[in-house]
């Protein structure tokens, strides 16, 4: 089957990108004696970039897009796992379609797993966006979690906090939010496993369990929060730290009395 090995040079990047249905342009047209106003790069269709985790069966094609604009026309380059990505880094190479700000990889294999970052830049600025690729078996597989989620948070005392965990799983996953806690001054139980508190778990609909919201947080709620996802094949977990800061002395409100509510203990592997 055809498998191009060199990046395709479709066209130079164009700010009048046909990838967008939007005809509007923030650029001023160049006249004989005036230069267009410089514009740092910006995303022209950020809503098309919201899906960051792409779990794709082997042999399929992956297309990542970073539709952009700017003046002068920005350049586009791609990194894999933070390093320069060259066509000879993968069997079959890849194609960069500059006119549509996209990279295309055909016939993906497990070694294509990783983070792919587009960098769009001109002399007035640089923007970047990272996609996560996982190459999966179509048959049931362990859960996969989007990298970087949940994210660490630092908030003021009394604030509300939202942690998010993006899950890709077939079969249906069970999602738990856990917090590492101390019992009688100890973080580890007699069985050598950490003490954890179950804050939330999925019922029939797991999508709402992907978000953990904490209201009116206290200093006692600082610590490590874990998103643990399991199905009958296996499990995955990722954690984030919550830091609750007190305002400066003169700004301090009345003492807040929100006792930590301990649902129950759970030994967590």
């Amino acid at each position: 089957r055809p498998s191009p090995t060199l990046p395709e040079q479709d066209a130079l990047p164009s700010s009048e990108d046909d990838d967008d249905d939007d005809d509007s342009s923030s650029e001023e047209k160049e006249t004989d004696n005036t230069k267009p106003n410089p514009v740092a790069p910006y995303w022209t269709s950020p809503e098309k970039m919201e899906k960051k985790l792409h779990a794709v069966p082997a042999a399929k094609t992956v297309k990542f897009k970073c539709p952009s604009s700017g003046t002068p026309n920005p350049t586009l380059r791609w990194l894999k796992n933070g390093k320069e990505f060259k066509p000879d880094h993968r069997i079959g190479g890849y194609k960069v379609r500059y006119a549509t700000w996209s990279i295309i990889m055909d016939s993906v294999v497990p070694s294509d797993k990783g983070n792919y970052t587009c960098i769009v830049e001109n002399e007035y600025g640089s923007i970047n966006h990272t996609y996560q690729l996982d190459v999966v078996e179509r048959s049931p597989h362990r859960p996969i979690l989007q990298a970087g989620l949940p994210a660490n948070k630092t908030v003021a005392l009394g604030s509300n906090v939202e942690f998010m965990c993006k899950v890709y799983s077939d079969p249906q996953p069970h999602i738990q939010w856990l917090k590492h806690i101390e019992v009688n001054g100890s973080k580890i139980g007699p069985d050598n496993l950490p003490y954890v508190q179950i804050l939330k778990h999925s019922g029939i609909n797991s999508s709402d369990a992907e978000v953990l919201t904490l209201f009116n947080v206290t200093e006692a709620q600082s610590g490590e929060y874990v998103c643990k996802v399991s199905n009958y094949i296996g499990e995955a977990n990722q954690s984030a730290w919550l830091t609750v800061t007190r305002p400066a002395l003169e700004e301090r409100p009345a003492v807040m009395t929100s006792p930590l509510y301990l649902e129950h203990h759970h030994h967590h592997h």
């Epitope: 089957r1 479709d10 042999a59 094609t61 297309k63 897009k65 194609k95 055909d106 078996e137 179509r138």
Partner: antibody
Framework: QVQLQESGPGLVKPSGTLSLTCAVS?????????WSWVRQPPGKGLEWIGE???????SYNPSLKSRVTISVDKSKNQFSLKLSSVTAADTAVYYC?????????WGQGTLVTVSS | SYVLTQPPSVSVAPGQTARITCGGN??????VHWYQQKPGQAPVLVVY???DRPSGIPERFSGSNSGNTATLTISRVEAGDEADYYC???????????FGGGTKLTVL
């Protein structure tokens, strides 16, 4: 150059099971490809039925999923289709094909008629 | 599930340019492939990955894909181009392959 050849009965009775096999030559069924079945009722368009990877991983058209089974026999370099509880609406030319994201090799197709 | 919409028929005079469209929700994010099928024959891939041509396919066949529409363009149409043309994607959301309904190209 990979070649695909469908084989199986051209006539199946209603409520029976349609069984077809696709022999792959000139290439290995263990390559990084999906092995697919596509059908085309007389005078109508192409309909994807389903596919299998050499590991046994499968994917099926949701409208046919309850009646379809696709299997692979690596030792014979072939894959098979079974479609149960057939009706006259399943009368079609059945193609086997090799695919990545697209179909780059096809069998010549075999007409299967469902009739008593 | 994902739906691809094609016009049932397109007519063009020899030597002119034929454009066959394939509509789908945000299809520009998918890779679109095109097949030519002549009566009594199996389909033949003419464009893959939106705009690439397999070896042996004339340069007259080209493709584009953006927004909600992919287009197969056949320039300098010949009588031998008369056939049914199908677009196809692998829908990454549902993990299924989908064909458009097909377009009959008639060369006048």
């Amino acid at each position: 150059q990979v070649q695909l050849q469908e084989s199986g009965p051209g006539l199946v009775k209603p409520s029976g099971t349609l069984s077809l096999t696709c022999a792959v030559s000139g290439g290995s069924i263990s390559s990084n490809n999906w092995w697919s079945w596509v059908r085309q009722p007389p005078g109508k368009g192409l309909e994807w039925i389903g596919e299998i990877y050499h590991s046994g991983s499968t994917s099926y058209n949701p409208s046919l999923k309850s009646r379809v089974t696709i299997s692979v026999d690596k030792s014979k370099n072939q894959f098979s289709l079974k479609l149960s509880s057939v009706t006259a609406a399943d009368t079609a030319v059945y193609y086997c094909a090799r695919a990545t994201d697209w179909f780059d090799a096809w069998g010549q197709g075999t007409l299967v008629t469902v009739s008593s | 599930s994902y739906v691809l919409t094609q016009p049932p028929s397109v007519s063009v005079a020899p030597g002119q340019t034929a454009r066959i469209t394939c509509g789908g929700n945000n299809i520009g994010s998918e890779s679109v492939h095109w097949y030519q099928q002549k009566p009594g024959q199996a389909p033949v891939l003419v464009v893959y990955d939106d705009s690439d041509r397999p070896s042996g396919i004339p340069e007259r066949f080209s493709g584009s894909n953006s927004g909600n529409t992919a287009t197969l363009t056949i320039s300098r149409v010949e009588a031998g181009d008369e056939a049914d043309y199908y677009c196809q994607v692998w829908d990454s959301t549902s993990d299924h392959r989908v064909f458009g309904g097909g377009t009959k190209l008639t060369v006048l």
